[in-house]
Interface confidence: medium
């Protein structure tokens, strides 16, 4: 799976979209999970309504919401009041039985609020040393990772 980078500004909302084949994934609930390290498990953050027919209803877990357009085939995740610790690697998932298919791998980058001068840095990355390949970007703000670019720079 390619990785799509979504950039948001600290303190603001970030909307992540995950398109999918609505016929292939018909009847399946969806989920948004956070990758714990490149090879680690994906920890569930929020999932769509328990009744698939009600997947269009927005469900919240803390500051993260999820809603699913099951006819159009678009899963939408909203990260409200984006914070530096929200930066990291996530997955949109399609659930079937005890298994989950990855719909999209997402790298969330948090940009500093340009009106907030308390921090000199302008971009927060997850504190991981691992890298991953085949990343590309959609603007939300979003961009493509260049070939060989490391989304998780080594921590000093």
């Amino acid at each position: 799976h390619n990785t799509t980078v979504f950039q948001g500004v600290a303190g603001q909302s970030l909307q992540v979209s995950c398109p999918y084949d609505s016929m292939k994934h018909w009847g399946r609930r969806k989920a948004w999970c956070r990758q714990l390290g490149e090879k680690g498990p994906c920890q569930r953050v929020v999932s769509t309504h328990n009744l698939w027919l009600l997947s269009f209803l927005r469900r919240w877990n803390g500051s993260t919401a999820i809603t699913d357009d099951t006819l159009g085939g678009t899963l939408t995740i909203t990260l409200r009041n984006l914070q530096p610790h929200d930066a990291g690697l996530y997955q949109c998932q399609s659930l079937h039985g005890s298994e989950a298919d990855t719909l999209r791998k997402v790298l969330v980058e948090v940009l500093a609020d340009p009106l907030d001068h308390r921090d000199a840095g302008d971009l927060w990355f997850p504190g991981e040393s691992e890298s991953f390949e085949d990343a590309h970007v959609e603007h939300s703000i979003s961009r493509s990772l260049l070939e060989g670019e490391i989304p998780f720079p080594p921590t000093s």
Epitope: D21, K24, G27, W52, L95, H96, G97
Partner: antibody, heavy 123, light 112 residues
Framework: QVQLQESGPGLVKPSETLSLTCTVS????????MNWIRQPPGKGLEWIGR????????NYNPSLKSRVTISVDTSKNQFSLKLSSVTAADTAVYYC????????????????WGQGTLVTVSS | DIQMTQSPSSLSASVGDRVTITCRSS???????????LHWYQQKPGKAPKLLIY???NRFSGVPSRFSGSGSGTDFTLTISSLQPEDFATYYC?????????FGQGTKVEIK
């Protein structure tokens, strides 16, 4: 109307590869999961695996996974089964079937089946 | 894998009889989306299986009303309210809640 037709050799030698094709007509081929199922003579049904023609995604029965490949040719409305290193235990009637057309509350059952083709593994 | 167990493995009945076949799964068949993907198929000798009931209790198109399905969780039943001559066949339950899909061993309904 919806039709599925299996084709392929009826006799395969032990240790060789069994190859079957299912040709589909009468509906939007790329939007339903397609399955292979087999039935040894006088026995029950065994699911082999499935493929989604839209993107080629596959799932296999773990008991056969190391020997099975299911592929699709959307230009011909066909999907294929290859089963390697066959033995007499692979002698069966092989069926192709689609999952019930994806409509609200109606998915995940096999509504249309091919008539089946008997494959005998023997030297 | 989910194991499907049918009972009885065979039965003899007469035209007009009420016939009940049971199917038990080794784990719950409730999918994460709330649906239960338990289906029933009918197969006659030399023919491909035909879908009778999908998702526990929904009759497939063209299936006579004498066929009905019920159950939940792990225990399911197929009932033929009044057996007809064309109903003598083998019946299979099947689950598609989880891959790999699995079938029961079949119940053969024979003429008494």
């Amino acid at each position: 109307q919806v039709q599925l037709q299996e084709s392929g050799p009826g006799l395969v030698k032990p240790s060789e590869t069994l190859s079957l094709t299912c040709t589909v007509s009468g509906y939007a081929f790329s939007s339903s999961w397609m399955n292979w199922i087999r039935q040894p003579p006088g026995k029950g049904l065994e699911w082999i695996g499935r493929i989604y023609p839209g993107d080629g995604d596959t799932n296999y029965n773990p008991s056969l996974k190391s020997r099975v490949t299911i592929s699709v040719d959307t230009s011909k409305n066909q999907f294929s089964l290859k089963l390697s290193s066959v033995t007499a235990a692979d002698t069966a009637v092989y069926y192709c079937a689609r999952l019930l057309r994806n409509q609200p509350g109606e998915s995940y059952a096999m509504d249309y089946w091919g008539q089946g083709t008997l494959v005998t593994v023997s030297s | 894998d989910i194991q499907m167990t049918q009972s009885p493995s065979s039965l003899s009945a007469s035209v007009g009889d009420r016939v009940t076949i049971t199917c038990r799964s080794s784990q719950s068949l409730v999918h994460s989306n709330g649906y239960t993907y338990l289906h029933w198929y009918q197969q006659k000798p030399g023919k491909a299986p035909k879908l009778l009931i999908y998702k526990v209790s929904n009759r497939f198109s063209g299936v006579p009303s004498r066929f009905s399905g019920s159950g939940s969780g792990t225990d399911f039943t197929l009932t033929i309210s009044s057996l007809q001559p064309e109903d003598f066949a083998t019946y299979y339950c099947s689950q598609s809640t989880r891959v790999p899909y699995t079938f029961g061993q079949g119940t053969k309904v024979e003429i008494k």
